[in-house]
């Protein structure tokens, strides 16, 4: 083979290369990108000898070997601000054709941080000695250089260009020359794979004469993976050499006919391809022996098969078709499991909704949050449910629980609260007096006062405005009632004073009972009936001390 | 734009042989596969082969072996099928496809507006 | 070879409604990378054949997304979200798994 002009190594679905020059890393990344590739990354240890080789290749073909460290860029840098993160492998530095933060590393030093200035990452060669395969270059972090000043000791850099595929290097059954171009525009004679898209010249004969013949083909996609130069046969055949010129070309057996031409075969197990020249493993899957949407996975030597069924369906016992997974058996909801065809479906029961940790799982809606809350006054949240509450003076109301309406103090079944007038409002009640009385410091009694004519005492009503003539009874005439503290239980009686704050309705106390002074009388604080969301059934009273808050959207919302 | 210009409809004699062409413009002719479809009247469409003009590498459907002869011209930018023997089971439409991308091998986005073969005596 | 199977017309559709086209295959054409070599292609009356979804459920260029496809390893099913007057033709799909490729028989979308 002929001296190849450039250092590249191909393996896997993609190729290196490298190259002398003192460039910044970012001249050197212009390179890369001119002819479709990035600086390399060495994101394992595998990719790290694959650049180890294309720097032992460019090293060889420097004449003399000079006494000193050289450095070769790769494709790590760190953004300037973007600082250090010793907990990670990359330390916070990233690959220029980006792709994941990862495992692989192989610092030379313990890095200083610095997040003042771009960062960039070389490899440090020792120029004088070869290249060990146990001994792969170290990473050595610096400034990224610029324009004429590229940075101590850097020598050179190193692509990288990725492939959909390669294709195997064509095989000569005599006398010949190959030499690949390869789509980054690198030319080669010794590439162990050759990426998609490169081109082949193949020169026969022994290249001082004239009978020599030449071939071209193109690395191309024939079929899902199948990539191919599109050859029939050995080239260069010459029946001078027969099967012994590099097994006449072919993959596993070579076979010579009584005239100078050969055949190429294959071991039992082994099929020969349409190139006449490689053999691949005899497909077993062929005679499509899997059903119901398996995948035929050939075995080894093409001896037997798998069938191999897509995600969510599993191999039933003839172990050719495939079924339904029943995912719902392995329990992976939290509450509520819905197999489908391949794959299954989690729900949750009415008051949850998805989220929480884990895949599947359920929390409890907040039907009380804010904006969201379906009581009137109180609302508490439960798990997978709520109850509403109402303030004092109110009891719930409505088909759904969720509404508070007006308890009527003056009409309760506790009796009289007043011991003259009642006046029902919002929420409360108030006391009053017929005229010549005046209510007592308590709220609740009347003591006999000044003679006067005109309406009872106690504030007048929007609603009865110039019903009555006469002045209202003096702020001094009313009492300042007051609640029993917050946190009292619900079902303790308690002596309730009326509130005198509001305008209300007046309610005459049935004559019977109306008397100059006397006792007050007990009164009840109604009990707060407790809805859930399902059921709508009322809890007993008691226990529930909890405050309520005015929400955004004029309802009541608590928690 | 990428265009497929095929040759015009062709009335030919029992055992005779037929060449077709297929201009290709607007890309790089030699780097993409062309194939090759036919579609007898009233019915569906059959793949015969294919060409990759960069390197002449062809594909053929077993049946059409024998039947029918890819080749490309890279210096006109155009796609040839030869029919031979031909039969009227050979009376057809035949449309040259274009893959989508360079070297790779599927799918067809782009047709030529097809040529009418007839065979009758 | 591989062999694609089409019925020959599809249910009536109205227009504006939804309407869908099935295929099948005698063996499955995903592939061990994980992609599915299942194609379909549109022929409108006189015309050449036009892809629209390529590699089971990838829209081709230029195609409405009125159009989906989905599938198994062997059954497919073209979708179209809102039928129009201009999809009337006849649905091909087709394997490119395989050499051969090959092509169903196609289906004739019906208005009703």
């Known amino acids: 083979t002929g001296a190849d002009t450039e250092a590249v190594v191909c393996a896997g679905t993609a190729c290196y290369t490298a190259h002398w020059g003192k460039l910044s890393a970012a001249e050197a990344q212009n390179l890369c990108l001119q002819n479709g590739g990035n600086l390399a990354t060495v994101k394992s240890e595998e990719e790290a000898q694959h650049v180890q080789q294309v720097l032992a290749q460019l090293l060889r073909r420097e004449a003399a070997l000079t006494a000193r460290m050289g450095k070769f860029w790769i494709g790590l840098q760190r953004e300037k601000g973007k600082c250090l993160d010793p907990s990670l492998p990359l330390k916070g530095f990233s690959w220029v054709g980006g792709g994941e933060d990862t495992p692989y590393s192989n610092w030379h030093k313990e890095l200083r941080n610095s997040c003042i200035s771009k960062r960039c990452v070389s490899l440090l060669l020792d120029l004088s000695q070869p290249l060990l395969p146990g001994r792969l270059p170290k990473w050595s972090e610096g400034p990224c250089g610029s324009p004429g000043s590229p940075g101590s000791n850097i020598e050179g850099f190193v692509c990288k260009f990725s492939f959909k595929g390669m294709c195997r290097p064509l095989a000569l059954g005599g006398p010949g020359q190959v030499t690949y171009t390869t789509p980054f525009q690198t030319t080669s004679s010794s590439l162990e794979a050759v990426p998609f898209a490169s081109a082949a010249n193949v020169a026969c004969g022994e290249g001082d004469k004239d009978d020599s013949q030449s071939h071209y083909f193109l690395c191309k996609e024939k079929a899902p993976d199948v990539f191919d130069w599109g050859s029939s046969g050995p080239l260069c055949v010459s029946p001078k050499y027969g099967c012994n010129f590099n097994n006449g070309g072919c993959h596993q057996d070579c076979f010579e006919g009584g005239d100078g031409s050969f055949l190429c075969g294959c071991r039992p197990g082994f099929r020969l391809l349409d190139d006449l020249v490689t053999c691949a493993s005899r497909n077993p899957c062929s005679s499509s022996p899997c059903r119901g949407g398996a995948t035929c996975i050939p075995g080894p030597h093409g001896k037997n098969y798998t069938c191999r069924c897509p995600q969510g369906y599993q191999l039933d016992s003839s172990q050719l078709d495939c079924v339904d997974v029943d995912e719902c058996q392995d329990s992976p909801c939290a509450q509520e499991c819905v197999n489908t065809p391949g794959s299954f479906r989690c729900e949750c029961w009415v008051g949850y909704e998805p989220g929480g940790p884990g895949e599947g799982a359920c929390q409890d809606v907040d039907e009380c949050a804010l904006g969201r809350s379906p009581c009137a006054q109180g609302c508490t949240n439960t798990e997978g449910s709520f109850h509403c509450s109402c303030e004092e003076g109110y009891v719930l109301a409505g088909e759904d629980g969720t509404q508070c309406q007006d308890v009527d103090e003056c009409v309760g079944p506790g009796g009289p609260l007043c011991d003259s007038l009642c006046f029902n409002t919002q929420g409360s009640f108030r006391c009053g007096c017929l005229p010549g009385w005046v209510l007592a410091p308590n709220g609740v009694s009347c003591a006999m006062g000044p003679v006067s004519l005109g309406p009872p005492s106690g504030p007048p009503d929007e609603e009865y405005k110039g019903e009555r003539e006469g002045s209202t009874v003096p702020p001094a005439a009313t009492a300042s009632p007051t609640r029993g503290p917050e946190g009292t239980p619900k079902s303790t009686p308690t002596t309730r004073r009326p509130l005198l704050s509001s305008d209300a309705p007046i309610t005459s106390v049935p004559l019977e009972v109306l008397a100059p002074s006397g006792s007050p009388g007990l009164w009840r604080e109604p009990s707060i009936h407790h809805t859930t969301a399902a059921s709508g059934a009322q809890e007993p009273a008691g226990g529930d001390s909890s405050v309520a808050t005015q929400n955004d959207d004029g309802t009541d919302g608590q928690k | 734009q990428v265009q497929l210009q095929q040759s015009g409809p062709e009335l030919v004699k029992p055992g005779a042989s037929v060449k077709i062409s297929c201009k290709g413009s607007?890309?790089?002719?030699?780097?993409?596969?062309m194939n090759w479809v036919k579609q007898r009247p009233g019915k569906g469409l059959e793949w015969i082969g294919r060409?990759?003009?960069?390197?002449?590498?062809?594909d053929y459907d077993g049946k059409f072996k024998g039947k029918a002869t890819l080749t490309a011209d890279k210096s006109s930018n155009t796609a040839y099928m030869q029919l031979s023997s031909l039969t009227s089971e050979d009376s057809a439409v035949y449309f040259c496809?274009?893959?989508?991308?360079?070297?790779?091998?599927?799918?067809?986005?782009?047709w030529g507006q097809g040529t009418l073969v007839t065979v009758s005596a | 070879d591989i062999v694609m199977t089409q019925a020959a017309f599809s249910n009536p559709v109205t227009l504006g409604t939804s309407a869908s086209i099935s295929c099948s295959s005698t063996?499955?054409?995903?592939?061990?990378?994980?992609?599915?070599?299942l194609y379909w292609y549109l022929q409108r009356p006189g015309q050449s054949p036009q892809l629209l979804i390529y590699?089971?459920?990838n829209l081709a260029s230029g195609v409405p997304d009125r159009f989906s496809g989905s599938g198994s390893g062997t059954d497919f099913t073209l979708r179209i979200s809102r039928v129009e007057a201009e999809d009337v033709g006849v649905y091909y799909c087709?394997?490119?798994?395989?050499?051969?490729?090959?092509f169903g028989s196609g289906t004739k979308l019906e208005i009703k």
């Open positions: 496809a274009r893959t989508g991308a360079a070297y790779e091998f599927d799918p067809f986005p782009y």
């Open positions: 607007g890309y790089a002719f030699s780097t993409y596969w």
């Open positions: 060409i990759f003009p960069g390197d002449g590498d062809t």
């Open positions: 063996k499955s054409l995903l592939h061990s990378s994980g992609i599915t070599y």
């Open positions: 590699r089971m459920s």
């Open positions: 087709a394997q490119m798994l395989e050499r051969p490729f090959t």
